[in-house]
């Protein structure tokens, strides 16, 4: 068992039929000796009296709000949590598994350039009774400061049948140097509280494996005389580092009618300018990419071709 | 030989299009490593992440974009930077940064040269012959030194007496490609930058 | 799958003109755009120009401009090249090729020789 | 227009060896490069498009690479199969053009 926050603690058991379960004991919060009474959650049944309580935990029903109190008054409260492992494996149920670009990805992270700040999000079904705190560091063994925010509902999808919810939240290191050549990962750690289970979730990169830059920004066309062929230009985005000739981007150009399907003109080039042939009803894109060091690409931005 | 100066003279394209050569040979060979060293930990989540420059070079620093000296964090994250001297910061006499810059990263070729030579002699000794060094990357590596035009004391290759644990030099081998290949990226941002301004 | 069928050789006097033809099957004609490519012997390819046949747009390379003339007829799924005032230099296997792609060759066509000469 | 260069002309190499061949561009033309192999009387087939990509059905013995002016394709391991014809070609800008070629032969 350990420490969550004040009051809230964690029961770590092994989940398998018939598991003895772990033997606690709670100690109630007062200098008061005698006359003290033991209750879990809003029950009134009288679960055991004195300073401290002794309890086998062995499934949900075990854990809860344990209250003690005397003549009436409530003493003080603690919260016990459940952190289930089965086969040696703690549970994952609270989140779901993105796939993306692993299999066991719970956690997802991209940050638009190199100052430091990223956005981490995960998806759960879970609508109720959910509570997320984040913290994250650069390094495990002497780590430097991540500063995190709070999680945030960040969208709401309908899957099929179900309902799936995203949350973010957005960390910024407290002392980066956007130059600088990354030794040490960046630890990030996720508590999840469904009810009374508990899950814990990490993800460990480098900023310059997740970066995805905005789209390309001010996409314009130019015509050329008689020709087919139209000169698109773009500008880098604002949210990118700078200086640009240091912090370079390479882009890719295509032209493409509505469908995944059609047919296409494709161009790739460091300048911010291109030529490309304009097909009436398709559209020009526009994505971006680190020159140097390949992560991932940007989102598209698009203008039609008419 | 001179100190290169700070003039945007097409002196400075030769460095950089020899710094693209070097980013893609360096890449190429890690990938190569990756795809032949498959059952040893070759990826960047599995190796340790090292830098047999630190504390010897300072290329980060002394390289720094002027538009990123007024960031505190890049200014402090190594105790031998270049340019913490107030005098040189605030004056930024360009030439003589870029002398120290390019001498810099002179340095970081040399000591990799050094290094991927004497683990190219140890893999030509493994029976397996499983993996070498892209000759194409060792020459890429060469022409950018040429190119930088410094005088230096050669560095000995080292040599070892004892067996060499194979599996070990692999192993390493990863370590260094990983390393070298950030610092190529930083090299070409440098060059690139440089080129611009 | 995509395939690409040319007519046969000929065989053309200076001075005349030539046109080629280049049946697709296995795939939507008007999905692809399609290209002429040719090759004199012993030497190497030579891209002569495009056509998008579901507009008949083109663009034909500045050395054959005027002289060449890409078709197509949906109907029967079948592009043209037509090449006018034939020189002995001209003298060359002619491929058509397909692509989804506007900018590189991915089906070819088997060829067509075309010899010029008096 | 810009001028596509291959080199060598021609390179000769026994079975099982690695080949090693180049193209350059007049002008910078980033990864807008594709690689094509051609037999005697046969058409070109494409092996690499984008400086890079592989294409299904293409064994992983041949591995592109380069960007800006310098491009090469890699033969890891030559089978009797891959002696022929290898051709760049860039497609940055129209006219589209290719290199004179690089032909590989039974040392």
């Known amino acids: 068992i350990w420490e969550l926050k004040k009051d809230v603690y964690v029961v770590e058991l092994d989940w398998y039929p018939d598991a003895p379960g772990e033997m606690v004991v709670l100690t109630c919060d007062t200098p008061e000796e005698d006359g003290i009474t033991w209750t879990l959650d809003q029950s009134s049944e009288v679960l055991g009296s004195g300073k401290t309580l002794t309890i086998q935990v062995k499934e949900f029903g075990d854990a809860g709000q344990y209250t003690c109190h005397k003549g009436g008054e409530v003493l003080s409260h603690s919260l016990l949590l459940l952190h289930k492992k089965e086969d040696g494996i703690w549970s994952t149920d609270i989140l779901k598994d993105q796939k993306e670009p692993k299999n066991k990805t719970f956690l997802r992270c991209e940050a638009k350039n190199y100052s430091g700040r990223f956005t981490c999000w995960w998806l759960t079904t879970i609508s109720t009774d959910l509570t997320f705190s984040v913290k994250s560091s650069r390094g495990s063994s002497d780590p430097q400061g991540v500063t995190c925010g709070a999680a945030t509902l960040s969208a709401e999808r309908v899957r099929g049948d179900n309902k799936e919810y995203e949350y973010s939240v957005e960390c910024q290191e407290d002392s980066a140097c956007p130059a600088a050549e990354e030794s040490l990962p960046i630890e990030v750690m996720v508590d999840a509280v469904h009810k009374l289970k508990y899950e814990n979730y990490t993800s460990s990169f480098f900023i310059r494996d997740i970066i995805k830059p905005d789209p390309p920004k001010n996409l314009q066309l130019k015509p050329l005389k008689n020709s087919r062929q139209v000169e698109v230009s773009w500008e880098y985005p604002d949210t990118w580092s700078t200086p640009h000739s240091y912090f370079s981007l390479t882009f890719c150009v295509q032209v493409q009618g509505k469908s995944k399907r059609e047919k296409k003109d494709r161009v790739f080039t460091d300048k911010t300018s291109a030529t490309v042939i304009c097909r009436k009803n398709a559209s020009i894109s526009v994505r971006a990419q680190d020159r140097y060091y390949s992560s991932s690409w940007s989102e598209w931005a698009s203008v039609p071709c008419s | 030989r001179n100190l290169p100066v700070a003039t945007p003279d097409p002196g400075m394209f030769p460095c950089l299009h020899h710094s693209q050569n070097l980013l893609r040979a360096v890449s190429n060979m890690l990938q190569k490593a990756r795809q032949t060293l498959e059952f040893y930990p070759c990826t960047s989540e599995e190796i340790d992440h090292e830098d047999i420059t630190k504390d010897k070079t300072s290329t980060v620093e002394a390289c720094l974009p002027l538009e990123l000296t007024k960031n505190e964090s890049c200014l402090n994250s190594r105790e031998t930077s270049f340019i913490t001297n107030g005098s040189c910061l605030a004056s930024r006499k360009t030439s003589f940064m870029m002398a120290l810059c390019l001498s810099s990263i002179y340095e970081d070729l040399k000591m990799y040269q050094v290094e991927f030579k004497t683990m190219n002699a140890k893999l030509l000794m493994d029976p397996k012959r499983q993996i070498f060094l892209d000759q194409n990357m060792l020459a890429v590596i060469d022409e950018l030194m040429q190119a930088l035009n410094f005088n230096s004391e050669t560095v000995p290759q080292k040599s070892s007496l004892e067996e060499p644990d194979f599996y070990k030099t692999k192993i390493k081998l990863c370590i260094l490609l990983h390393a070298f290949r950030i610092r190529a990226v930083t090299i070409d941002r440098v060059m690139s930058y440089l080129n611009a301004s | 799958q995509v395939q690409l069928v040319q007519s046969g050789a000929e065989v053309k006097k200076p001075g005349a003109s030539v046109k080629v033809s280049c049946k697709a099957s296995?795939?939507?004609?008007?999905?692809?755009?399609l290209h002429w490519v040719r090759q004199a012997p012993g030497q190497g390819l030579e891209w002569m120009g495009w056509i998008d046949p579901e507009n008949g747009d083109t663009e034909y390379a500045p050395k054959f401009q005027g002289r060449v003339t890409m078709t197509t007829d949906t109907s029967t799924s079948t592009a043209y090249m037509e090449l006018r005032s034939l020189r002995s230099d001209d003298t060359a296997v002619y491929y058509c090729?397909?692509?989804?792609?506007?900018?590189?060759?991915?089906?070819w066509g088997q060829g067509t020789m075309v010899t010029v000469s008096s | 227009e810009i001028v596509m260069t291959q080199s060598p002309a021609t390179l000769s190499v026994s079975p099982g060896e690695r080949a090693t061949l180049s193209c350059r561009a007049s002008?910078?033309?980033?990864?807008?490069l594709h690689w094509y192999q051609q037999k005697p009387g046969q058409a070109p087939r494409l092996l690499i498009y984008f400086a890079s990509q592989s294409i299904s059905g293409i064994p992983a013995r041949f591995f592109g690479s380069g960007s800006g002016t310098e491009f090469t394709l890699t033969i890891s391991s030559l089978q009797s199969e891959d002696f022929a014809v290898y051709y760049c070609q860039q497609s940055n800008s129209f006219p589209l053009t290719f290199g004179g070629g690089t032909k590989v032969e039974i040392k």
């Open positions: 090729n397909a692509n989804k792609e506007l900018r590189y060759f991915d089906v």
């Open positions: 296995g795939y939507a004609f008007t999905d692809y755009y």
């Open positions: 002008q910078s033309i980033s990864i807008n």
